[in-house]
């Protein structure tokens, strides 16, 4: 009687621990994507960056999908999104087209149900990269907390893509789920 | 019989609530470390900053260790890491060695099993801090989501350490665990 | 007997799942507030920004309160706080009062029990916005992990408020609870 109940209870406890642990793990999608510099577009215009690593070095993804240059949400929730974008230029790369630059990043959300794109976060700076200095560098960081629905897509747009720093510690973006939607 | 089972169940519920709450608390390491400016080095070269507060003002640490200038991971997991580094110079401090500066931060991970160091995140800017202005200021923020294993160490390297802003709201870094590793 | 216990157990499991899910949701306050540009103060001095949206576009709030220009904590905990502040100027807006600017943000915490205000995070840059360029832009991002008590208030102070970018993707701040206080 009583002993049997205790055994059952222990089983409840054990399975609960497994279930809680498993569901907690499965409930937390994330991604950290690093720039794939083999295919960075040239020019100074604003472009969507489509080449990112998701499974080498610091790059990783779980319960989200990376497809066609976009980070796709598989699970409704509130996510913290972030991006770090580094720009650099050395005189050995040749002269800049202009010394006055607008170095910008835009983190955008696309809904495929209603085909529309909206900017969630932007950051950057206008810079005067004078020929008096042989090397120039500038980094942007943005981050924020957003409600994302399954099927929505996150992408990164930058100006002056040819100036991007191709290192994995320099140019990356990511997301992690913080909580469910009520 | 039935009443006894209900009491046992209530006990399961109660202990579970305690256990879940307690394990949740214990499962979430964090740290927010602020610069200890009593011993900031001079020079413009890159140095590892080893003096940080972990228990005064905004600085705090739980289920992680601060030792030998490094933040040590005690629990495997995925962590959000961040750093905010402020540089400043006032003409009353004397002339700068040069007006062309590279103000940078590097967040590095060291594995002690295989003594090797890797940069997780970097940020910064080249700056022209002209003598025409009596005061100069610049801040860098970086953040990202990384898999950390127990025993790994996080440290901060900066260039131009003598220009660091010593305020606790200016120069700090931190981490908090978001989820377990599957 | 045994069948009845199993049914009871299933009930425990089910209610537990509901309870755990519900309590988890309720235990995670958050806010993402975007600038309300209808009421941005003029001047170059440091001011507290009091007009923010909390329920339109990307702006949202849950288990926190927005009142009198401040984000009020309703639940003790450790929170990740962040702010993104964009400044911009176009020559069509007229000349700047000075070309040498200090573009800064301060994230402050006010305790109403002990009326005192403290800066948690600061960031920014001195800038030379020369008349040679028709457009200038600069963004600041700060973030950090802080212990907040119920009743404490978070506010944003900036210098040069008249230069703020009024877009919701540009100028915002937020918070989300990561864990309880032990």
């Amino acid at each position: 009687g009583s002993q049997h109940i205790r055994a059952e209870k222990a089983m409840v406890d054990g399975s609960w621990l497994d279930l809680a642990k498993r569901s907690k793990l499965e409930a937390q999608p994330f991604a950290h994507l690093t720039i794939n510099a083999t295919d960075i577009p040239s020019g100074s215009h604003k472009v969507s960056l489509s080449s990112w690593y998701h499974d080498r070095g610091w790059a990783k993804i779980s319960n989200m999908t990376f497809s066609n240059g976009k980070l796709i949400v598989n699970q409704d929730g509130f996510y913290y999104l972030y991006a770090n974008i580094c720009f650099r230029h050395h005189e050995t790369s040749g002269d800049l087209a202009t010394e006055y630059l607008q170095l910008m990043v835009y983190v955008t959300k696309t809904s495929i149900k209603i085909p529309s794109s909206h900017t969630l976060m932007k950051g950057g700076s206008t810079k005067y990269w004078s020929g008096n200095s042989e090397f120039h560098f500038y980094s942007i960081n943005v981050g924020g907390f957003f409600k994302l629905r399954s099927g929505e897509e996150i992408s990164i747009e930058v100006s002056n893509p040819s100036l991007l720093d191709p290192d994995q510690d320099a140019t990356y973006f990511g997301a992690f789920k913080v909580r469910d939607i009520d | 019989g039935s009443q006894h089972i209900r009491a046992e169940k209530a006990m399961v519920d109660g202990s579970w609530l305690d256990l879940a709450k307690r394990s949740k608390l214990e499962a979430q390491p964090f740290a927010h470390l602020t610069i200890n400016a009593t011993d900031i080095p001079s020079g413009s070269h890159k140095v590892s900053l080893s003096s940080w507060y972990h228990d005064r003002g905004w600085a705090k640490i739980s289920n992680m260790t601060f030792s030998n200038g490094k933040l040590i991971v005690n629990q495997d997991g995925f962590y959000y890491l961040y750093a905010n580094i402020c540089f400043r110079h006032h003409e009353t401090s004397g002339d700068l060695a040069t007006e062309y500066l590279q103000l940078m931060v590097y967040v590095t991970k060291t594995s002690i099993k295989i003594p090797s160091s890797h940069t997780l995140m970097k940020g910064g800017s080249t700056k022209y801090w002209s003598g025409n202005s009596e005061f100069h200021f610049y801040s860098i923020n970086v953040g990202g989501f990384f898999k950390l294993r127990s025993g790994e160490e996080i440290s901060i390297e900066v260039s131009n350490p003598s220009l660091l802003d010593p305020d606790q709201d200016a120069t700090y870094f931190g981490a908090f665990k978001v989820r377990d590793i599957d | 007997g045994s069948q009845h216990i199993r049914a009871e157990k299933a009930m425990v499991d089910g209610s537990w799942l509901d309870l755990a899910k519900r309590s988890k949701l309720e235990a995670q306050p958050f806010a993402h507030l975007t600038i309300n540009a209808t009421d941005i103060p003029s001047g170059s001095h440091k001011v507290s920004l009091s007009s923010w949206y909390h329920d339109r576009g990307w702006a949202k709030i849950s288990n926190m309160t927005f009142s009198n220009g401040k984000l009020i904590v309703n639940q003790d905990g450790f929170y990740y706080l962040y702010a993104n502040i964009c400044f911009r100027h176009h020559e069509t807006s007229g000349d700047l009062a000075t070309e040498y600017l200090q573009l800064m943000v301060y994230v402050t915490k006010t305790s109403i029990k002990i009326p005192s205000s403290h800066t948690l995070m600061k960031g920014g840059s001195t800038k030379y916005w020369s008349g040679n360029s028709e457009f200038h832009f600069y963004s600041i991002n700060v973030g950090g992990f802080f212990k907040l008590r119920s009743g404490e208030e978070i506010s944003i102070e900036v210098s040069n408020p008249s230069l703020l970018d009024p877009d919701q993707d540009a100028t915002y701040f937020g918070a989300f609870k990561v864990r309880d206080i032990d």
Epitope: H90, T92, S133, E134, F135 | D39, P41, S42, G43, S44, H45, K46, V47, S48, L49, S50, S51, N68, G69, K70, A97, T98, E99, Y100, L101, Q102, T110, I112, P115, S117, T126, S155, S162 | -
Partner: antibody
Amino acid sequence: SLEESGGRLVKPDETLTLTCTVSGFSLYNYEINWVRQAPGKGLEWIGYIDVGSGTWYASWAKGRFTISKTSTTVDLKITSPTTEDTATYFCTRKYNPMDLWGPGTLVTVSS
Amino acid sequence: DMTQTPASVEVAVGGTVTIKCQASQNIGSNLAWYQQKPGQPPKLLIYSTSTVASGVPSRFKGSGFGTQFTLTISGVQCDDAATYYCQQGYSAGNVNNPFGGGTEVVVK
């Protein structure tokens, strides 16, 4: 790689300039140091020039040595050398740590 | 600025040698060790107190923090006969010499 040149026999008070030529990496990312070693003695740091051409000198070397650079070379000017400046002079990359060293160039100061 | 001991040490093949370096101020983990053989420039062995440089055998181990640092060579080989120098990489202003005086290791 790094290679020093310009070492020779000089008379006291005769100005001498040594040159460090850099190849395979760019100066924009690294400080370049000058370190010397008198015969049978230890290593002695003279100073470095940083990415923005800022210079930092050992307290004993200020005023006696000048470091400057172009896009691929770093010079060390020794003004009014004395016999105590007889040494092998090395240029090195980075200060913390000095991860790459040139082979050195010998300077002999003698009347 | 950096005090290195001993100035000279003799060790048998297969033995262990310990070299100490003391900084006059807290330098955190910003310490490097170099090996120099006659007629050659120094070669970086260890940096950031304990990180072994590329291509350096695992018998070289660095430790310490703050002001006290140690280089340990275990299972000494004939090829390890050289002079070893420590160097603080922390500060470059108001520095007399960031290098220690050196330790000559003689292998018997």
